[in-house]
Interface confidence: low
């Protein structure tokens, strides 16, 4: 395509002249005359149109094709558009003297829209109002060749597509060429055909790579703020879809009662700092963008933004910090159009406490600084969760103030590894810290490969952990899986628009915070014959460390009065304890913890209960009484024996039956089983009769028993 005219990213001029006239006006970049160039030989801006006659009409022309060129070489034919009318050249014979006196000029500017979908050419007639009364039409013929290498120098007739340009205002027409994304780097060939009153003006072939002609959308989100160090930060964001980095031109003006200044800066970042800002001033800013590392077109200017500074400027205007820290505020104070000298500035806290002068610093003639040391937590005052810091002059305080938020970030994080050693649960509460509106809290952690360092510190590389608020007001976060011997350094980050604060970090080794499963197979019994409370258990499978055990036992009932017993022998699986009541039901529970003291006590095991059963033979037989009935003169009398049931403590722990042992001199010895009755009657017939009542349980008969001997003479006893 060496015959095509390469379009540049600036406005150029199409000159169309009648045949046989000298080519004095060709397309030149805007602002230069025919033989002018800049130091590197490139044309840069458009020449103003020049007319010999501004009132010429084309009334006596019909179907005349004008010769149009972009070049200043007079003797060279322009490249032709293959699709021109009937294949004619641009040079036609015109007899009219009128058209030998003028040339027809158009300004043309083309670019690829910021969305990278439409290639736009604007065609502006420099014959202002000349075509108003004619049927004025502009068409753009274009082709995106599929394969450049095999194409002829000029595409064949019929390969061009034609778009009708929208000429809503006669002097300016908009031609839109859709460009597929895949073709952005290809060469687009095109030419213009302008028709008016039967006259055809046709341009030479033009070539362009759309990607080199991008006109981005204006930058977005232009805003301004005063930085913590007192500069005005102008920032914006680049428009979407731009496939390459941009450079930006920022123009701003500062208007105050004392100074008006304007500036224009080119930057590659999306922000610009303006120093030496003044109170009570307004700053108007606009920004535009253009490709940074290649050809392109400046975007339109963004909508102007105005930022007005107050009569008192605090920087920073708000500080969020933690207890014990030191912070500083600066201020510039303007009063009645004069900046208050910094040495005259006085600082107040909450308009109630004058800040001692020893805390002031004169930064410059106009900037005063106050520093607070070793700050205490802000105490809420009604709805205010901050301290108001006022910059005042000698006579009054401005109603504006800076805000100081001081938060106690000492948040305790406690962690516990489960008995299966599969997960670690960490808990923390915000009840100790003052709530800050619109703040979020997040647990962050860093896991080291092995162990914790002596002094935990906040690691630059950390991860957030999801935590969920529980009904008890604590947040709970679960680490699963876990690395038992890795050090998990964790802290709470308070995120707020004013900045973020971190609680002091704590480091946890999952292995050191294990809460074991409770011991299993817990059994409790009172041992037969020995009469001790024997408690046995099995230690949990995890952890493998040596464990200590705690036993609690007590008489079973609604409220057990527990007694504690501790076992430090990791190998122990049972213990026997003396108890006062061998015939009561005892409840027993066991729990465990690492012997070295690390971690937590397990939950108590499910309770085990002793079963009341006979431990030993009854300690004694029952005490008994007798009633003798019958005639005192007769030798035979009825004797009734009475006794109370033996108590548990004496029966150890039950009585199955009672046995009466008799002894007489004549009949010798015999026994009678009375079952579990507590009354027995026999016939006393002999001179002497001895009876003993024995208590019998599953172990045997009582050993220590009471005897009673009946002998003559004897009287009735009631």
């Amino acid at each position: 395509f060496n015959l095509s005219y390469p379009i540049t990213p600036w406005r150029f001029k199409l000159s169309c002249m009648p045949p046989n006239s000298t080519y004095d006006y060709f397309l030149l970049p805007a602002g230069l005359s025919k033989n002018t160039s800049n130091s590197n030989g490139h044309y840069e801006t458009a020449v103003e149109p020049k007319f010999n006659s501004s009132g010429t009409h084309f009334s006596n022309l019909s179907k005349t094709t004008f010769h149009c060129c972009f070049r200043s070489e007079q003797d060279r034919n322009c490249s032709l558009c293959a699709d021109n009318i009937e294949g004619k050249t641009f040079v036609s014979t015109v007899n009219s003297l009128v058209f030998q006196q003028i040339d027809a000029n158009w300004n043309i500017q083309c670019w690829l829209k910021g969305d990278l979908k439409l290639f736009i050419c604007y065609v502006e007639s420099l014959f202002k109002n000349l075509f108003r009364n004619y049927n004025y039409k502009v068409h753009l013929l274009y082709v995106l060749p599929e394969v450049l290498e095999d194409s002829p120098l000029v595409p064949q007739k019929g390969s061009f597509q034609m778009v009708h340009c929208n000429c809503s205002v006669h002097e300016c027409c908009e031609c839109l060429v859709p460009v597929p994304t895949a073709k952005l780097n290809d060469t687009l060939l095109m030419c213009l055909k302008i028709t008016s009153g039967g006259v055809i003006f046709q341009s030479p072939l033009m070539s362009v790579q759309p990607i080199n002609m991008v006109k981005p959308d204006p930058p977005l989100g232009l805003h301004m703020e005063i930085t913590d160090d007192g500069n005005l930060k102008i920032s914006w964001s680049s428009p979407p879809l731009v496939p390459f980095p941009l450079q930006y031109q920022v123009k701003y003006s500062e208007n105050s009662t004392t100074v008006i200044r304007e500036a224009d800066k080119i930057v590659s970042a999306t922000s610009l700092l303006v120093d030496s800002i003044l109170p009570g001033s307004s700053y108007e800013v606009q920004v535009r963008g253009k490709r940074l590392d290649g050809p392109g077109i400046w975007s339109d200017w963004s909508t102007p933004r105005v930022f007005t500074t107050q009569d008192v400027i605090y920087f920073p205007p708000k500080i969020l910090t933690s207890v014990g820290s030191n912070v500083s505020f600066h201020c510039i104070y303007k009063k009645e159009n004069k900046i208050v000298p910094s040495k005259e500035i006085v600082w107040w806290m909450n308009l109630a406490e004058k800040i001692p002068q020893s805390q002031y610093d004169v930064v410059s003639d106009h900037v005063s600084k106050v520093t607070f040391f070793n700050l205490n937590e802000t105490k809420p005052r009604g709805k205010f969760t901050y301290d108001a810091v006022y910059c005042c002059n000698e006579h009054e305080c401005h109603h504006r103030y800076a805000e100081l938020y001081v938060i106690d970030v000492n948040i305790n994080i406690s962690c516990e590894t489960d008995g299966y050693l599969t997960k670690m649960t960490c808990r923390w509460s915000t009840s100790t810290i003052q709530s800050l509106a619109e703040s979020t809290l997040q647990l962050r952690y860093h896991r080291s490969s092995l162990y914790c360092s002596d002094i935990p510190s906040i690691h630059p590389i950390s991860e957030p952990k999801d935590c969920y608020l529980q009904s008890d007001g604590f947040y709970e976060c679960i680490f699963q899986p876990i690395f038992l011997l890795s050090g998990y350094t964790m802290w709470i980050r308070i995120n707020h628009s004013l900045g973020s604060l971190d609680s002091p970090p704590t480091c946890v080794l999952p292995d050191s915070v294990v809460k074991p499963l409770p011991p299993s197979s817990v059994k409790a019994e009172i041992t037969i014959n020995i009469g001790l409370l024997k408690i046995s258990w099995e230690k949990p499978v995890f952890p493998e460390n040596n464990l200590q055990f705690q036993i609690r036992y007590g008489l079973s009932g609604k409220e057990v009065q527990w007694k504690m017993y501790e076992v430090y022998d990791a190998k122990s699986k049972s213990v026997s304890l003396p108890v006062p009541d061998l015939c009561a039901v005892y409840a027993v529970q066991v729990r465990c913890k690492r012997l070295d003291g690390l971690g937590y006590w397990s939950n108590w095991s499910n309770p085990a209960y002793t079963v009341v059963m006979d431990i030993k033979v009854p300690m004694r037989g029952p005490e008994f009484w007798r009633i003798i009935n019958g005639d005192t003169m007769k030798k035979e009398k009825n004797v009734t024996l009475l006794w109370k049931p033996l108590m548990k403590n004496d029966s150890l722990c039950s009585v199955q039956r009672y046995v009466i042992n008799h002894h007489t001199s004549c009949n010798g010895t015999w026994s009678e089983d009375v079952g579990n009755h507590t009354k027995f009657t026999f016939l006393w017939t002999e001179q002497a009769h001895t009876v003993t009542v024995l208590a019998i349980n599953s172990i045997g008969a009582s050993v220590a028993n009471f005897n009673l001997t009946f002998s003559w003479p004897m009287s009735k006893v009631n």
Epitope: L351, A352, K354, E394, H395, E396, H398
Partner: antibody, heavy 120, light 107 residues
Framework: EVQLLESGGGLVQPGGSLRLSCAAS????????MSWVRQAPGKGLEWVSA????????YSADSVRGRFTISRDNSKNTLYLQMNSLRAEDTAVYYC?????????????WGQGTLVTVSS | DIQMTQSPSFLSASVGDRVTITCRAS??????LAWYQQKPGKAPKLLIY???TLQSGVPSRFSGSGSGTEFTLTISSLQPEDFATYYC?????????FGQGTKVEIK
Amino acid sequence: EVQLLESGGGLVQPGGSLRLSCAASGFTFSSFAMSWVRQAPGKGLEWVSAISGSGGSTYSADSVRGRFTISRDNSKNTLYLQMNSLRAEDTAVYYCAKDQGDWDFLFDYWGQGTLVTVSS
Amino acid sequence: DIQMTQSPSFLSASVGDRVTITCRASQGISSSLAWYQQKPGKAPKLLIYTASTLQSGVPSRFSGSGSGTEFTLTISSLQPEDFATYYCQQLNYYPFSFGQGTKVEIK
């Protein structure tokens, strides 16, 4: 010579209103904060209200906030105290006092005082 | 609010005596304290500010000292015109409270 002259005191019923004035001379009035300080009969001094030189900032003691309003007219070199919803405990001699200038409620000149009696 | 407590409330002294009045603040007020003198039927008069700075025109027999919570006003040699009531005032915290006063009487 600095002079401060209070006026407007008198007898008023509880719930009533009074407006005290303090005419200042001998100094650049608009450059200094001014205050009202009162003294109940036989009692000590109590700071009541203050206003900055330009009149842009005002502060009052809790005991009078919402009832008393301090103001100034720099063109007339005059300080005012509008007292509404007066109570018996507001009975006192009211002094107007000139701030030394540091906006630190340090009073280097005082008026002779005007007596306000609130009684039914 | 800051409470300012003066002691003694009454003080009897003779001309030529050295007199000391104490003022205590319920919390630290740095050196933001002033002393005033008031004679019966008259307005108060500023004597000392920032705890120890003598107001211009005040005789040098008056002096002040202290910082934090405890302050003193000293009259090195009492003169007949010094019999009056003396008030301290804290200037550090709203509402800029005064002490209850110390009356210096002729013995």
